[in-house]
Interface confidence: low
C-alpha cells in the first residue's frame, strides 16, 4: 500500500500593498495535484507577529488570506496542504509546511520615532491624533502621518497637521465615512537631513476611542418628599442614547459625595427635608453596547438649587 | 441656577454710543458664548452678533459689524455691547442670551434692556 | 443670509386645541446629521424661552405638550394640546449659518 503524500503550496508569501499592516497572504496550489483531481484541496494557514506567543490559524480552500498586523514587528507565517480524509480513503494527509516572513527594515533608531501618541474620535465625529517628537531629535525633523481603513483606495496622508515650533505634532482628520468597527491604521514616519528616523505603526477601531460630548441641560424636580430627580439630555450628534453610560457626582451641603454610573439620563436621588444644597454634575462615556473601550467625557457645567424649596421649583428656567 | 441680569434702560441722543452689561451667574461663564438680540417695539427678532467667553472671538451680523462691539470681562462673568452711532431704528430692547453651541439654541436669555434713542 | 419664513403669522385657538406652526428656510439648515433649527416661546414684555433646539430636542423644564420636527428646510412646532399659559409668539430661528436668522414669528391668540 503506496502512503500517500501530497506538497506544501508553492509560492507563499507576504504582500503589502501599502495599507499600513494590512496584509495580504498568497500562495499557488501544490505540484502534482493531478492524482487528487475529485479533492477539494484545503491550506491550513498559521501566522503571527513574531515575538507573540500565539499563531493565529486558518483553514481555507482559497489561496489568499488577508488580515491586520504591527508592522512595528516582524511577521511569521506558514502553511500546509490539507487532503481531507474523503480523498485518502482513510485518513487526512498533511503536506510539510512552507514558511515565509516579512518585515520593514527599520531605519533609525527607537528613539527618534514619535512619542506618546494619542488618538481620540471626538463625538465620533472628528479624529484628531498628536504625539510627541522622539528624544534628541532636531527641530529640522519632522513627522508625516499616513492612514487607512477598508474602503480607502489607498493610503492618504493627512492634510491638516497641528504645529508647534514649526513642526507636525498632530493631525485634525477630515470626515472619516463608514470608518468604525473595522481596523484603522496610521503609520507616522520622519524626515531629517541629520540622521533617519523610524517609523511608527499604530491600529484601533475609531469607535473604541471615542470621547463624547458632556451631556447638557441638568435639572431637578422633587418627586416626593424625600426623593428628588436629577435629569440631563444626552449631547447632540451621532452617538444613539442607547450607547451611554453616565457617571453623576452630587453634592448634598458640601459634605457627602456621591458619585452613580446609570445608563439612562434619570437619577433619583434619597434626599432628607432639611438639604440646603444640592449639586450635581454628570459626563458620558460610550457603553460596552456599542464599543469595547472608550473615554470618559468632560463633566458638564455644574447644575446647583440653594436655599429654596425643591418642591416648588424646577431648575435652569 | 443660571441668571443674566443686564444693564437698566438708556435714554441717548442720535449719534451717540451706549454701552450694555449683561452679568452672568449659576455656570461657568467661559464655557459658553454669549449672544446680543435686538428687538424693536412690537417687531420680531434680530440677531446682533455673539462672543466665545472663553477666547474672546466674536462672529457679527454684517449688518451690525461696524457699529456694535462685543467685549467680556472673565473676572467679573461679565459681557458687553457697545453700539456706536446710534439712530431712532436703534430704539429697541436688546437681549443677551447664552448658547452652549451652534446646535444648542439660547437657552437662557437676560431680562433686556430698552434703548430710546431720541433728540 | 438664510431667510426663515413662519406660516401663519397669526392663528386663533381654543385651550385643549392641537395647533401647528411651520417654519420654512430658504436653505436646507442641516449639517452633520443635526438640524440647526431652533423654537421660542414670546410672552409680552418678557424676554424668548427656548422651547426646542436642534429641531426636536426639548429645552428643559418645556412641558412635552411642545415638539418639534422636520429636516432640511421645513419645520414644525406642535403643541398637541393648547394651555392657557401657551397663548404667546412662537419664534423660529437657523442656527446653522452667521448671520443666525429668525422667523417673523406667529403670534397664538384666544379664540
Known amino acids: 500500500d503506496t502512503e500517500i503524500k501530497v506538497n506544501p503550496p508553492q509560492d507563499f508569501e507576504i504582500v503589502d500593498p501599502g495599507y499600513l499592516g494590512y496584509l495580504y497572504l498568497q500562495w499557488q496550489p501544490p505540484l502534482s495535484l493531478d492524482h487528487f483531481k475529485e479533492c477539494t484541496v484545503e491550506y491550513e494557514l498559521k501566522y503571527r507577529n513574531i515575538g507573540s506567543e500565539t499563531w493565529k490559524t486558518i483553514i481555507t480552500k482559497n489561496l489568499h488570506y488577508k488580515d491586520g498586523f504591527d508592522l512595528n514587528k516582524g511577521i511569521e507565517a506558514k502553511i500546509h496542504t490539507l487532503l481531507p480524509w474523503q480523498c485518502t480513503n482513510g485518513s487526512e494527509v498533511q503536506s510539510s509546511w512552507a514558511e515565509t516572513t516579512y518585515w520593514i527594515s527599520p531605519q533609525g533608531i527607537p528613539e527618534t520615532k514619535v512619542q506618546d501618541m494619542d488618538c481620540v474620535y471626538y463625538n465620533w465625529q472628528y479624529l484628531l491624533c498628536s504625539w510627541k517628537p522622539g528624544i534628541g531629535v532636531l527641530l529640522d525633523t519632522n513627522y508625516n502621518l499616513f492612514y487607512w481603513y477598508e474602503g480607502l483606495d489607498h493610503a492618504l496622508q493627512c492634510v491638516d497637521y497641528i504645529k508647534a515650533d514649526g513642526q507636525n505634532i498632530g493631525c485634525r482628520f477630515p470626515y472619516l465615512e463608514a470608518s468604525d468597527y473595522k481596523d484603522f491604521y496610521i503609520c507616522v514616519n520622519g524626515s531629517s537631513e541629520n540622521k533617519p528616523i523610524r517609523s511608527s505603526y499604530f491600529t484601533f477601531q475609531l469607535q473604541n476611542i471615542v470621547k463624547p460630548l458632556p451631556p447638557v441641560y441638568l435639572t431637578f424636580t422633587r418627586e416626593s418628599s424625600c426623593e428628588i430627580k436629577l435629569k440631563w439630555s444626552i449631547p447632540l450628534g451621532p452617538i444613539p442614547a442607547r450607547c451611554f453610560d453616565y457617571e453623576i457626582e452630587i453634592r448634598e451641603d458640601d459634605t457627602t459625595l456621591v458619585t452613580a454610573t446609570v445608563e439612562n439620563e434619570t437619577y433619583t436621588l434619597k434626599t432628607t427635608n432639611e438639604t440646603r444644597q444640592l449639586c450635581f454634575v454628570v459626563r458620558s462615556k460610550v457603553n460596552i453596547y456599542c464599543s469595547d473601550d472608550g473615554i470618559w467625557s468632560e463633566w458638564s457645567d455644574k447644575q446647583c438649587w440653594e436655599g429654596e424649596d425643591l418642591s416648588k421649583k424646577t431648575l435652569l428656567r | 441656577q443660571v441668571q443674566l441680569v443686564q444693564s437698566g434702560a438708556e435714554v441717548v441722543k442720535p449719534g451717540a454710543s451706549v454701552k450694555l452689561s449683561c452679568k452672568a451667574s449659576?455656570?461657568?461663564?467661559?464655557?459658553?458664548?454669549m449672544n446680543w438680540v435686538k428687538q424693536r417695539p412690537g417687531q420680531g427678532l434680530e440677531w446682533i452678533g455673539r462672543?466665545?467667553?472663553?477666547?474672546?472671538?466674536?462672529h457679527y451680523n454684517q449688518k451690525f459689524k461696524d457699529r456694535a462691539i462685543l467685549t467680556v470681562d472673565k473676572s467679573t462673568s461679565t459681557a458687553y455691547m457697545e453700539l456706536r452711532s446710534l439712530r431712532s431704528e436703534d430704539t429697541a430692547v436688546y437681549y443677551c442670551?447664552?448658547?452652549?453651541?451652534?446646535?444648542?439654541?439660547?437657552?437662557?436669555w437676560g431680562q433686556g434692556t430698552l434703548v430710546t434713542v431720541s433728540s | 443670509d438664510i431667510q426663515m419664513t413662519q406660516s401663519p403669522s397669526s392663528l386663533s385657538a381654543s385651550v385643549g386645541d392641537r395647533v401647528t406652526i411651520t417654519c420654512r428656510a430658504s436653505?436646507?439648515?442641516?449639517?452633520?446629521?443635526?438640524?440647526?433649527m431652533n423654537w421660542f416661546q414670546q410672552k409680552p414684555g418678557k424676554a424668548p424661552k427656548l422651547l426646542i433646539y436642534?429641531?426636536?430636542r426639548q429645552g428643559s423644564g418645556d412641558p412635552s405638550r411642545f415638539s418639534g420636527s422636520g429636516s432640511g428646510t421645513d419645520f414644525t412646532l406642535t403643541i398637541s394640546s393648547l394651555q392657557p399659559e401657551d397663548f404667546a409668539t412662537y419664534f423660529c430661528?437657523?442656527?446653522?449659518?452667521?448671520?443666525?436668522?429668525f422667523g417673523q414669528g406667529t403670534k397664538v391668540e384666544i379664540k
Open positions: 462672543i466665545d467667553a472663553y477666547a474672546g472671538e466674536t
Open positions: 430661528q437657523q442656527s446653522k449659518e452667521v448671520p443666525w436668522t
Open positions: 442670551a447664552r448658547g452652549y453651541g451652534d446646535a444648542y439654541g439660547m437657552d437662557h
Open positions: 436642534a429641531a426636536s
Open positions: 449659576g455656570y461657568t461663564f467661559t464655557n459658553y458664548w
Open positions: 436653505e436646507s439648515v442641516d449639517n452633520y446629521g443635526i438640524s440647526f
